[in-house]
Amino acid sequence: PTGAVEVQVPEDPVVALVGTDATLRCSFSPEPGFSLAQLNLIWQLTDTKQLVHSFTEGRDQGSAYANRTALFPDLLAQGNASLRLQRVRVADEGSFTCFVSIRDFGSAAVSLQVAAPYSKPSMTLEPNKDLRPGDTVTITCSSYRGYPEAEVFWQDGQGVPLTGNVTTSQMANEQGLFDVHSVLRVVLGANGTYSCLVRNPVLQQDAHGSVTITGQPMTFPPEA
């Protein structure tokens, strides 16, 4: 509608690492003569409409969201209605709506994408001694406390992908972070290197682990 307040947010999701602070950007264009006494600003969860933070009646009404949110009071008069979310958790992931009312009202939604890097994978072998060519072994690649769910890839020493006989499980802990365990069953050749790559699809972060089997004995390469 003509003259309706225009609320602007980034189109792309805001990516925030678990435990860090995130800024959900939101802005509006104040008209000449605008004062904060005219402003009503509401941040709420888009899906449930649960109140997160508000500025009404000329003052910051504070956080209604675990006391982890704050506005930028010095910037409000210039049309900066952004929200600071502190100590981001997995449970914060989702869409937040910025609602602005002055003479009329408008809203826009910004998505928060939470991420956590995966640890360097640890590799275990079963059985792990007296190995001979032709033996079947299971190699387990474990990586911890990442988010969101990982993509896991296996390859041999020549870089050839290994897709058969792979079982991957991902379990969320109480914070919502995932522990990944991927098991590769292989028949040993004379010697070989087997690598697993754990990829965080949001951070585009790759964590690598590998094991080299040379008949007897077996060696693990030093940590990078």
Epitope: P1, A4, V5, E6, V7, N40, I42, W43, Q44, T46, D47, T48, K49, Q50, L51, V52, S54, T56, A64, S95, T97, F99, S101, I102, R103, D104, F105, G106, S107, A108, A109
Partner: antibody
Amino acid sequence: QVQLVQSGAEVKKPGSSVKVSCKASGGTFSNYAINWVRQAPGQGLEWMGGIIPLFGTANYAQKFQGRVTITADESTSTAYMELSSLRSDDTAVYYCARDFDAPGSGVNFGMDVWGQGTTVTVSS
Amino acid sequence: DIQMTQEPSLTTSPGGTVTLTCRSSTGAVTTSNYANWVQEKPGQAPRGLIGGTNKRAPGTPARFSGSLIGGKAALTITGVQPEDEAIYFCALWYSNLWVFGGGTKLEIK
């Protein structure tokens, strides 16, 4: 359970104005947008505008800008829609609508609960 | 102007499942469009069925469900009843205004 009760049918002359009321009961009023929607005979639904009583701010569809005024009285939990410069093609059933109650929510824009409708006939 | 497209009419049988969709000319429908679904029967006031994409209004039977499918808002009726014969309108919120679709006439044969 939220209920919306609207004022009775009106017959108006072209060029005049009509004011329709919508009283909310059984729930919170302030932070729920009251939307006004009309339906002309044999036509679909058309959003005219809405108001958030908590802030007293209203938005209007471009088509009705300058001809419609939506207000609200928090003390009586009543919203009003006034349409001026009436024409014969404003003959329609006018509805108010709002979200159902959701405790702990911020601002609610939706249209889950509807009034019974007010028939406005514009005829000379 | 924003255009919303609904199937003009659909026919289904009692006990069947039917999905009505609502497409927006502006692109994919998201949760921030707060898709509403409204049922209208002849001689009756419209009745809100679904709000906020997928939340059933009080009194809406469990056979009605809302979702987003392929960038469109969708209303699915599972186990259709004869009394579900009606016109169904979708409405989407665009920052500061609501836009209604043209409605889908659902016939039950």
